[in-house]
Interface confidence: low
């Protein structure tokens, strides 16, 4: 997977009146980096992991930049001329990439309430509009005010593009990010289900990086996709992942069954819990 | 001390009317919008209302329009929710709370609204 | 409206357990998501605010992430006091809505 840093910032407008402040989340490789505290009007950084990417410094430079594209956003919301009553929202993801090729790529997107309307590849400047009339005239509005602002120059899109791959760059300098493996923790858990059964549940949490393979066998031989349910792997907020995957089983088969997992390179397998202890962790 | 206080409820017959009040204090109530969200018994929370900061514009659950009226009275730091035309399934506790429009960090105690025949 | 499913819908567990809760909306709502905490005849608390930014006073071992459609809220290391009912809620756009909630109990 290519390196990415993705900006997530957003503004609300009530009755047409643009809310002041903004949210703000920055994710670096897919996992919550940055956020902006909006009661302490502060880039802050989510978890350990992401305090380690930067050292001991301080985070100006991002409520710097975080304060100004927020800014920016909330004088574009104040420029749509939508319905005007109630709250609304006005969304702006920016992402860049490095490939392993080196090769790079950016690009923008605008949702309102929730809804793409507009999106811009940042290298070549190509703007990619929906096709419902909803989203052509709120793109309209958008593009129409991006084009007065004498900011939002050619100049202004590569820079953009140029800021966004240089702070990916000086994060990826720091080695943390390159070399972080942190292996799952697992645990089985079993629960009644309907007369006979159980249903047996293998969590892997607090995992990084994201790819995994978690999955119940029988006698050493994988279940089928149809008789598992998996559950999404899910950011768990410490800049690791957390993820499941569950089967029903007949009652008093369960040494027959183990969850098998595997992660950068590592793998192993974990039993079914008898029934008087319910729960079995483990690191491997 | 920031504080939000309900009154009003009652227990009263399908089809009948109440009014609720919400009385703010240790905050500047007129810079705040402030909602109405009820609680029936043993079930989940349920937006019901907000109104706007100045009391211009005001909206609505579905469950409760054409039915319930939102109001303040800035003067008085007080916000009301007249509620018309009763049913079974408005029994509820009813909270006011603020967010500006954010999370709701300040909730009234509650007012326990019964509508029974 | 925008829908919030939360899951679990109950959660047996053991004080210092970890304990995840998931929250996901039916379409993007950014970090315009909230989570309360509601013990039974108390008032909502909140927790969480714009999806990650923890509410003054509330302990640190509460945590939330996600943007977009997908939320969780952790608690590293229960405590017997964290027995309650959990409810995310999106202020994105009207009307407001809140998840159905999570009942989290003594296992």
């Known amino acids: 997977e290519p390196h990415s840093l993705r900006y997530n910032l957003t503004v609300l407008s009530w009755d047409g009146s643009v809310q002041s402040g903004f949210l703000a989340e920055v994710h670096l490789d897919g996992q919550p980096f940055l956020r902006y505290d909006r009661q302490k009007c502060r880039a802050k950084p989510q978890g350990q992991w992401a305090e380690d990417v930067l050292g001991n410094k301080t985070w100006d430079r991002e409520t710097r930049d975080l304060t100004g594209n927020g800014k920016d956003l909330r004088m574009t919301l104040a420029h749509i001329k939508d319905q005007k009553e109630g709250l609304h929202s006005l969304q702006e993801i920016r992402v860049c990439e490095i490939h392993e090729d080196n090769s790079t790529r950016s690009s923008q997107h605008f949702y309102y309430d929730g809804e793409l309307f507009l999106s811009q590849n940042l290298e070549t400047e190509e703007w990619t509009v929906p096709q419902s009339s909803r989203a052509q005239t709120l793109a309209m509005n958008v593009r129409n005010f991006l084009k007065e602002d004498a900011m939002k120059t050619k100049t202004h899109y590569h820079a953009m593009h140029a800021d966004c791959l240089q702070e990916l760059r000086r994060y990826l300098e720091s080695g943390v990010v390159l070399r972080r493996t942190v292996p799952p923790m697992v645990n089985v858990t079993r629960s009644e289900a309907s007369e006979g059964n159980i249903t047996v549940t293998c969590r892997a949490s607090s995992f990084y990086p994201r790819n995994i393979i978690l999955t119940w066998r029988q006698d050493g031989v994988s279940l089928s996709h149809d008789t598992q349910q998996w559950g999404d792997v899910l950011p768990d907020g410490n800049g690791t992942y957390q993820t499941w995957v569950a089967t029903r089983i007949c009652r008093g088969e369960e040494q027959r069954f183990t969850c098998y997992m595997e992660h950068s390179g590592n793998h192993s397998t974990h039993p079914v819990p008898s029934g008087k202890v319910l729960v079995l962790q483990s690191h491997w | 001390q920031v504080q939000l206080v309900e009154s009003g409820g009652d227990v009263v017959q399908p089809g009948r009317s109440l009014r609720l009040s919400c009385a703010a204090s240790g905050f500047t109530f007129s810079n705040y919008n402030i909602h109405w969200v009820r609680q029936a018994p043993g079930k989940g929370l349920e937006w019901v209302a907000v109104?706007?900061?100045?009391?211009?514009?005001?909206y609505y659950a579905d469950s409760v329009k054409g039915r319930f009226i939102i109001s303040r009275d800035n003067s008085k730091n007080t916000l009301y929710l007249q509620m018309n035309s009763l049913r079974a399934e408005d029994t509820a506790v009813y909270y006011c709370?603020?967010?500006?429009?954010?999370?709701?960090?300040?909730w009234g105690q509650g007012t326990m609204v019964t509508v029974s025949s | 409206a925008i829908q919030l499913t939360q899951s679990p819908s109950s959660l047996s567990a053991s004080v210092g357990d970890r304990v995840t809760i998931t929250c996901r909306a039916s379409?993007?709502?950014?970090?315009?998501l909230a989570w309360y905490q509601q013990k039974p005849g108390k008032v909502p608390k909140s927790l969480i605010y714009?999806?990650?930014s923890l509410e003054s006073g509330v302990p640190s071992r509460f945590s939330g992430s996600g943007s977009g459609t997908d939320f969780t809220l952790t608690i590293s290391s229960l405590q017997p006091e964290d027995f309650a009912t959990y409810y995310c809620?999106?202020?994105?756009?009207?009307?407001?809505?809140f998840g159905q909630g999570t009942r989290l109990e003594i296992k």
């Open positions: 714009d999806a990650s």
């Open positions: 709370a603020s967010g500006p429009p954010d999370a709701f960090n300040i």
């Open positions: 109104i706007r900061y100045d009391g211009i514009n005001k």
């Open positions: 379409q993007g709502i950014s970090s315009a």
């Open positions: 809620q999106q202020f994105n756009s009207y009307p407001i809505t």
